[in-house]
């Protein structure tokens, strides 16, 4: 028996809900008296959803997952996840029997979109040529960890002397802190980018030092 | 009616090999999953081996993988078991079966593989 | 893998009893779990299939229930030809098709 699924991850936003597709193909005289479908997690064989005998034997996964009943004759045995989290990501396997039996997984990959960074300057007051300066970027409860580059106002990348942390939440999104050390010229801007590596998204932070005053676009 | 009917068991010397044969008959053999089951002397059941009705998929129990293969000739209506390196723990009868989500339905009459010098 | 732990291992009773075996995964399996009868020398024979469905030509004393991890097969009144030993089985999902150990019922 031939199940199919998505050879990609399903990528899902964190609190959407996600669709892991999977199908066969009937033969002629197909019944969904004979149908036994089995969602589980891969790797531990845990039990996500089923159906068996004629009927929905229910989701064993928080009550955050569903088939699509109406379309399991034609073969559609895929699976509705909902509000994703963090902690879902992960293969899933698929396994259909009937007579015969097949199995197939799909990996879901999590995403969530970094917010938009913050700076702060370390002094930030007083600052003249030459000072050595502490910016801070800062972006939150993103997913999965980020990738973090520096730059100069002429777009020059800046990677000596930048420590990057990401600390997971209790949710499992990261929150993202770069510090970037810095000798001060006449002046300047600084930016930093924080790129989600699934979502291919960036999100962008600057500041500019004139002298007096400084700002924060 | 279902039938299925094995052969090939036999005694054989630890290290030996053994094929196993059993013959469908009844049913559309090619749209059914099957499998091999073997019962050790005054044991219970152990679930031997499964292939998928195309011959795609085949699984083993731990106890038989790299020595054991099953394979089917569906235009011969016949499921075998291929039984390499045997071991005196493989002494058992063992039976063909028909099935899968729902059971096996039906099962073959048995054939003796006894390992021994 | 999924392992089955049935009990008792073995129990005595009469023609006419009312007997019980119970079976429990290791995980749950949903209703993936089968019941067979075995007579001496013969081939195991299913009864019950998805915990509770009686397998076509089965006599309607052998009744299964459960979901999950816990099954039972009931025979609600013993017949000579019941004096042997059922083996529970699951087939959740990918092999390995694991069995329990076995239930010998014999004549008290």
């Known amino acids: 028996l031939e199940v199919q699924v998505p050879e990609d991850p399903v990528v899902a936003l964190v609190g959407t809900d996600a669709t892991l597709c999977c199908s066969f193909s009937p033969e002629p005289g197909f019944s969904l008296a004979q149908l036994n479908l089995i969602w589980q997690l891969t790797d531990t064989k845990q039990l996500v959803h089923s159906f068996a005998e004629g009927q929905d034997q229910g989701s064993a996964y928080a009550n955050r997952t569903a088939l699509f009943p109406d379309l399991l004759a034609q073969g559609n045995a895929s699976l509705r996840l909902q509000r994703v989290r963090v902690a879902d990501e992960g293969s899933f396997t698929c396994f259909v029997s009937i007579r015969d039996f097949g199995s197939a997984a799909v990996s879901l990959q999590v995403a969530a979109p970094y917010s938009k960074p913050s700076m702060t300057l370390e002094p930030n007051k007083d600052l003249r040529p030459g000072d050595t300066v502490t910016i801070t970027c800062s972006s939150y409860r993103g997913y999965p960890e980020a990738e973090v580059f520096w730059q100069d106002g002429q777009g020059v990348p800046l990677t000596g002397n930048v420590t990057t942390s990401q600390m997971a939440n209790e949710q499992g999104l990261f929150d993202v802190h770069s510090v970037l050390r810095v000798v001060l010229g006449a002046n300047g801007t600084y930016s930093c980018l924080v790129r989600n590596p699934v979502l291919q998204q960036d999100a962008h932070g600057s500041v500019t030092i004139t002298g007096q005053p400084m700002t924060f676009p | 009616e279902v039938q299925l009917f094995q052969s090939g068991g036999g005694l054989v010397q630890p290290g030996g090999s053994l094929r196993l044969s059993c013959a469908a008959s009844g049913f559309t053999f090619s749209s059914y999953a099957m499998s091999w089951v073997r019962q050790a002397p005054g044991k219970g059941l152990e679930w031997v081996s499964a292939?998928?009705?195309?011959?795609?998929?085949?699984y083993y129990a731990d106890s038989v993988k790299g020595r054991f293969t099953i394979s089917r000739d569906n235009s011969k209506n016949t499921l075998y078991l291929q039984m390499n390196s045997l071991r005196a723990e493989d002494t058992a009868v063992y039976y063909c079966?028909?099935?899968?989500?729902?059971?096996?339905?039906?099962w073959g009459q048995g054939t003796t593989v006894t390992v021994s010098s | 893998d999924i392992q089955l732990t049935q009990s008792p291992s073995s129990l005595s009773a009469s023609v006419g009893d009312r007997v019980t075996i119970t079976c429990r995964a290791s995980?749950?399996?949903?209703?993936?779990l089968n019941w067979y009868r075995q007579q001496p020398g013969k081939a195991p024979k299913l009864l019950i299939y998805?915990?509770?469905s009686l397998q076509s030509g089965v006599p309607s004393r052998f009744s299964g229930s459960g979901s999950g991890t816990d099954f039972t097969l009931t025979i609600s009144s013993l017949q000579p030809e019941d004096f042997a030993t059922y083996f529970c089985?699951?087939?959740?999902?990918?092999?390995?098709?694991?069995f329990g150990q076995g239930t010998k019922v014999d004549i008290k």
């Open positions: 292939i998928s009705g195309s011959g795609g998929s085949t």
């Open positions: 079966a028909r099935g899968v989500g729902r059971g096996f339905d039906y």
């Open positions: 089985q699951q087939t959740y999902s990918t092999p390995p098709w694991t």
């Open positions: 998805a915990a509770s």
């Open positions: 995980q749950s399996i949903s209703i993936y």
